[in-house]
């Protein structure tokens, strides 16, 4: 609550986070034309990525282009790309949605349709679907531990999110334990009424606010984070603006002196841990 | 402007960032002591990194030290490095100019000069210029999408620069479309008053501004971002301050069970994404 | 110092990072089944990794894991995790602590302990201490050159502090030199009361306090800023919340047609960079 | 039906070398550590050597140094090389695998062995 007669200062905070978890993926795989169930273990230096700062990530999908290898080829036949003769097509030409540099000539890309050739990472990344249930579906069982220090260096003040008397097996309850910092990322969804399942195909940025409203005066010293959740992307945004989350990276590799790269779309989830609040003294 | 009767309440900001774009690059290659033409294609997954946060990097230069080993080699002779005896060679010195430790001899680095030699990864990194011009120049024709959700918690209330109305093919422009929020990223520097293709040379740190000065009483509600740009690092900064901006990256791979790297030398444009502003309310 | 008259507002801070330095590695390696002294050396590409934003780590230790595959295998004997019949394996079951998904066998792990079998990236990682003392000690002597540029947009004032009088070889010292923005890392942590040899061992976190307190009256004009160190990680902290800084990553690579992975337990030093401050003005 | 089906072995003098291979057919999702058992006549089943699909090998303390043994993941076959053959090496030689027919549904399998026979 506001004290008028209190001096206020911003949060000074620093964040680091750890994911546990595994998840169990299966998928079709194809070798040598043939195709088979494919069935691995994702841990987390398989899904995660070493972040600073306070935001970290999480997979839950991924397309794999694998093999590509800089060449010509046609592009993909997405809509509005076919072509019929090279008049179609522009040398020195590169669509921003296209992932190469046209040649100029107009070349079948299967039996039934003809694109304009570019000089690219080939075969040209296909634009198909997130896979759909998720293939990281159960990262919902997943769980973060958030560890928070803040500072306020005007009150000479510091403090943090874990305390000594803390249990380490606790898992965050908004009732019946909300000093807890592991969370479920299941239960992050939930209490920000999102549905994981359903996210987890196109990915999302969610955000966990941790709000420090500190008095630090020692009458009536308090000084507890707050955790809430709120989605920060925009589920209903129009195709144009590229819905929910997603990044490209590629891994490089020679075979035969030629390089060669599996170029992997991967989707998930960013959270984003914003860290607000006031320290007020006398 | 300052509506004193007001409660004013710093911004809380979450930033999502999209690039888009391919470059041709053209450069000679060396194989088998053989220099030709190379010619390679760059899409967002060779040129760009996943990254968090309020940051994005697109590399816009390179300089390549392929199949380096751990091993002994003579160290560059860059200014004051050669020597002409082992008595100029000191065993166990790590120099911070130099990239390894001194053996205590002095060998020849080339048929005219002889250096210390050094414990590295080798051969060691020559210390040549970035290429000129910029062999990503082309970054210049990319675009950035640039998503951000705010918070005022206080006022409880949540809004992002992206509105329903707003067409995703739009580019901004500061007087025709100052609320379209993909960014072509020469148009950035034009309006920070740079030169995009001196810049990309050795790589520098643009800022993208977001002010939100939020008006949220009911009878006079406004509340959408103003963008600017301005150039972070310093253009005039003295050698020894590493003007510029460049990171060193490594790609490992074994062959003949030796483990080697392809060291890269990434000079980019790292932009950073600033979202300030207040919400005020009666 | 308050001066109740002034307009305050606070800083808008962007920090550009460059670590300098080698390490000399020296570390037991075992290769068919020989153990050997190997020695390697480390430079920025090898101990740090390209970060935006206001962060940089530092890689002070490790565990490798080579060679692991996606296969079945014993899972590593931790307390509590060993077996002596197939009862007290389930199939299907994820142990949090464990690495895999069992598949209800009890198998042998070594001639001398049986537990349950698992299909994870095989063999497991050994739950083992990181090296004692850390293999990149010698870190301590790296330096760290800090770039802040700085803005009041409400006062239209930027500013930085790298000035261009300074001296791109000074060191930083609190009473010799506060101005010089070249760190040694070693030096932070004795600022901080810290042991750089004893954090380098599981890692910690870092705070770099960069403290603005800007008058930007013209008459009494004054703006640089103030460097202090505090280390943010709880070095007291119970072993079930993780002490210490480090993550997991990985090197994936193909040999015999099947897909391999190095995975690496990275310790080390983050480094956060903290920025706050306010210009005033009447 | 999985089968592994083991070829080479014979007669050979002491001091001699043959290769031993074990290939596995049928319909199943991975194979995973293969291996090579030897029973001499009047004695247990013991190990020879074994590997896992990340070619990572262990040999018995008799054998080492003399016999190794690898893999083909594309052909899921297992080799064994024996040099410096010994009298006391003679022994019927089985392969084993365990392959795992669905996701996590593995099954040790056998195969029906093969002759080592050295004279001195």
């Known amino acids: 609550s506001d004290k008028l007669y209190q001096r206020k200062e911003p949060v000074i905070s620093s964040v680091h986070t750890k994911v546990k978890g595994i998840a169990e993926v299966t998928e079709n795989v194809t070798e040598g034309g043939v195709t088979k169930l494919g069935h691995s273990i994702f841990d987390t230096a398989d899904y995660t990525f070493p972040l600073q700062g306070n935001s970290f990530f999480v997979m839950t999908n991924y397309v794999k282009s694998e093999g590509q290898v800089q060449t010509l080829c046609p592009e993909y036949p997405r809509r509005g790309a076919q072509c019929s003769s090279d008049r179609r097509c522009k040398k020195g030409w590169m669509d921003p949605q296209s992932k190469g540099i046209q040649t100029g000539r107009c070349v079948p890309y299967d039996k039934t349709r003809k694109t304009c050739e570019v000089s690219a990472w080939c075969p040209t990344e296909e634009e198909k679907e997130a896979p759909r249930p998720a293939l990281l579906r159960s990262a919902e069982n997943f769980t973060v531990l958030i560890k928070n220090n803040i500072h306020f260096p005007g009150h000479n003040y510091t403090t943090r999110n874990i305390l000594p008397t803390m249990n380490g097996s606790c898992t965050f309850h908004k009732t019946w334990d909300p000093q807890c910092s592991i969370f479920r990322l299941g239960d992050i969804f939930q209490e920000a009424g999102e549905n994981f399942t359903e996210v987890a195909v196109q990915g999302g940025i969610m955000g966990i606010e941790i709000y420090w409203d500190c008095n630090l005066d020692s009458w009536s010293h308090h000084c507890r984070p707050r955790y809430s959740f709120r989605r920060l992307d925009d589920k209903n945004m129009d195709e144009s603006f590229v819905p929910g989350y997603n990044f490209r990276y590629a891994k490089y590799y020679k075979e035969n002196n030629v390089e060669k790269r599996t170029l992997i779309k991967a989707f998930g989830i960013r959270f984003d841990i914003l860290v607000f609040g006031t320290g007020g003294k006398f | 402007s300052d509506k004193l009767y007001q409660r004013k309440e710093p911004v809380i900001s979450s930033v999502h960032t999209k690039v888009k774009g391919i470059a041709e690059v053209t450069e000679n290659v060396t194989e088998g002591g053989v220099t030709k033409l190379g010619h390679s294609i760059f899409d967002t997954a060779d040129y760009t990194f996943p990254l968090q946060g309020n940051s994005f990097f697109v590399m816009t230069n390179y300089v390549k030290s392929e199949g380096q080993v751990q091993t002994l080699c003579p160290e560059y002779p860059r200014r004051g490095a050669q020597c002409s005896s082992d008595r100029r060679c000191k065993k166990g010195w790590m120099d911070p100019q130099s990239k390894g430790i001194q053996t205590g001899r002095c060998v020849p680095y080339d048929k005219t000069r002889k250096t210390c030699e050094v414990s590295a990864w080798c051969p060691t990194e020559e210390e040549k210029e970035a290429p000129r011009p910029a062999l990503l120049r082309s970054a210049e024709n990319f675009t950035v999408l640039i998503k951000n959700n705010i918070h005022f918690p206080g006022h409880n209330y949540t809004t992002r620069n992206i509105l329903p109305t707003m067409n995703g093919s739009c580019t901004f422009h500061k007087t025709w479309d100052p609320q379209c929020s993909i960014f072509r990223l020469g148009d950035i520097f034009q309006e920070a008053g740079e030169n995009f293709t001196e810049v990309a040379v050795q790589g520098g740190i643009m800022g993208i501004e977001i002010y939100w000065d939020c008006n949220l009483d009911s009878w006079s509600h406004h509340c959408r971002p103003r963008y600017s740009f301005r150039r972070l690092d310093d253009k005039n900064m003295d050698e020894s301050f590493v003007p510029g901006y460049n990171f060193r990256y490594a790609k490992y791979y074994k062959e003949n069970n030796v483990e080697k790297r392809t060291l890269i030398k990434a000079f980019g444009i790292r932009f950073d994404i600033l979202v300030f502003g207040t919400g005020g309310k009666f | 110092s308050d001066k109740l008259y002034q307009r305050k507002e606070p800083v808008i801070s962007s920090v550009h990072t460059k670590v300098k330095g080698i390490a000399e590695v020296t570390e037991n390696v075992t290769e068919g089944g020989v153990t050997k002294l190997g020695h390697s050396i480390f430079d920025t590409a090898d101990y740090t990794f390209p970060l935006q934003g206001n962060s940089f780590f530092v890689m002070t230790n490790y565990v490798k894991s080579e060679g692991q595959v996606q296969t079945l295998c014993p899972e590593y004997p931790r307390r509590g995790a060993q077996c002596s019949s197939d009862r007290r394996c389930k199939k299907g079951w994820m142990d949090p602590q464990s690495k895999g998904i069992q598949t209800g066998r009890c198998v042998p792990y070594d001639k001398t302990r049986k537990t349950c079998e698992v299909s994870a990236w095989c063999p497991t990682e050994e739950e083992k201490e990181a090296p004692r003392p850390a293999l990149l000690r010698s870190a301590e002597n790296f330096t760290v050159l800090i770039k802040n540029n700085i803005h009041f947009p409400g006062h239209n004032y930027t500013t930085r502090n790298i000035l261009p009088t300074m001296n791109g070889s000074c060191t930083f010292h609190k009473t010799w030199d506060p101005q010089c923005s070249i760190f040694r890392l070693g030096d932070i942590f004795q600022e901080a009361g810290e042991n750089f040899t004893e954090v380098a061992v599981q890692g910690g976190i870092m705070g770099i306090e960069i403290y603005w307190d800007c008058n930007l009256d013209s008459w009494s004009h004054h703006c640089r800023p103030r460097y202090s160190f505090r280390r943010l990680d709880d070095k007291n902290m119970d072993e079930s919340f993780v002490p210490g800084y480090n993550f997991r990553y990985a090197k994936y690579y193909k040999e015999n047609n099947v897909e391999k992975r190095t995975l690496i337990k990275a310790f080390g030093i983050r480094f956060d960079i903290l920025v706050f401050g306010t210009g005033g003005k009447f | 039906e999985v089968q592994l089906v083991e070829s080479g072995g014979g007669l050979v003098q002491a001091g001699g070398s043959l290769g031993l291979s074990c290939a596995a057919s049928?319909?199943?999702?991975?194979?995973?550590?293969m291996a090579w058992y030897r029973q001499a006549p009047g004695k247990q089943r013991e190990l020879v050597a074994d590997i896992t699909r990340g070619d990572r090998t262990n040999y018995a303390d008799t054998v080492n140094g003399r016999f190794t043994i690898s893999r083909d993941n594309v052909r899921n076959t297992v080799y064994l090389q024996m040099n410096g053959l010994k009298p006391e090496d003679t022994a019927a030689y089985y392969c084993y695998a365990r392959i795992e027919l669905g996701v996590l549904e593995p099954r040790d399998y056998w195969g029906q062995g093969t002759q080592v026979t050295v004279s001195s």
């Open positions: 049928g319909n199943f999702f991975r194979v995973n550590t």
